[in-house]
Amino acid sequence: EVEKTACPSGKKAREIDESLIFYKKWELEACVDAALLATQMDRVNAIPFTYEQLDVLKHKLDELYPQGYPESVIQHLGYLFLKMSPEDIRKWNVTSLETLKALLEVNKGHEMSPQVATLIDRFVKGRGQLDKDTLDTLTAFYPGYLCSLSPEELSSVPPSSIWAVRPQDLDTCDPRQLDVLYPKARLAFQNMNGSEYFVKIQSFLGGAPTEDLKALSQQNVSMDLATFMKLRTDAVLPLTVAEVQKLLGPHVEGLKAEERHRPVRDWILRQRQDDLDTLGLGLQG
């Protein structure tokens, strides 16, 4: 807290400019009018205020807007955003994607902070759903964003938004999350032809049921082992040896290297030895 002192003669700020960089904290408190600051927020980020000076500027805005900042101020916060607490952010109403992008840019290079998580939560709740543009923006800044959501939160993702999802965005998703995302992806990509469809749906297959895997096995997709190993065990178990052979194509030889790991191990144990022998891989059921 900066104590109240009178502004020295000739130091009253007429505008937010670089001369303020060399003001001490108490001078900023005494000589910068909060309303002036609010109307010239776009200049604040262009001026390299110090960490401690930004505390003073935040204090001024907090006094001016005790119920929360208006979006006209929020979109120009720049480095002041890093001074905000989740409690501050919960008072905001952020509706513009440009505002969201501007604030995420400030946090670039850092892990997702509680402030950013709160900001995103406020933004998405305000929109009512995770639309494609929002998802595009969030996954560009935080590739793991989608997998940080609960299955309940993922249920609000419309199928049209799935087009924005890249394979790496799903790297840390667990089966419960893929269970929610897979049907949406299936719907989103339903009008694509066989090989193109497989390229798009591949990352989501950890949520696919047995009947969809059986259907894929009829389409010469040549699924790689990495994708196969991420399939749900309960979806793989009912597949026949012939179906797995068709599903994997030339990659079927990779089963030998994975024979001790799920779901391959459990699938092998469900097959007749005669059928396994047709693969010529020496798999023992």
Partner: nanobody
């Protein structure tokens, strides 16, 4: 937090030059403005120069034309080139990036 390490201080005669360097430990150095402060014995710490992440530089009135702040984001380093040094420039010089501070490097200007 970014770790900062200053170097380049020392004893120099009036009118001489020194170049201070401050190396940062993390790549996010380039996200922030960087500053040099100084503190003379018995005085308050003062901001000498600051450089925005865009490269715009600002200098305290009393050092303008003598001191120049610069940065090399690839090397995660901020510099302070000090020319025409005066006895009143004697102080411990500190590097600052966001909420991180260096340990300080002593600059003494004396004949």
């Amino acid at each position: 937090q970014v770790q900062l390490q200053e170097s380049g201080g020392g004893l120099v005669q009036p009118g001489g030059s020194l170049r201070l360097s401050c190396a940062a430990s993390e790549s996010i150095f380039s996200n922030y403005s960087a500053s040099w402060y100084r503190q003379a014995p018995g005085k308050q710490r003062e901001l000498v120069a600051t450089i925005a992440r865009t490269g715009s530089a600002f200098h305290l009135g009393s050092v303008k034309g003598r001191f120049t702040i610069s940065r090399d984001n690839a090397k995660r380093t901020v510099y302070l080139q000090m020319n025409s040094l005066l006895p009143e420039d004697t102080a411990v010089y500190y590097c600052n990036v966001w909420d991180s501070w260096g340990q300080g490097t002593q600059v003494t200007v004396s004949s």
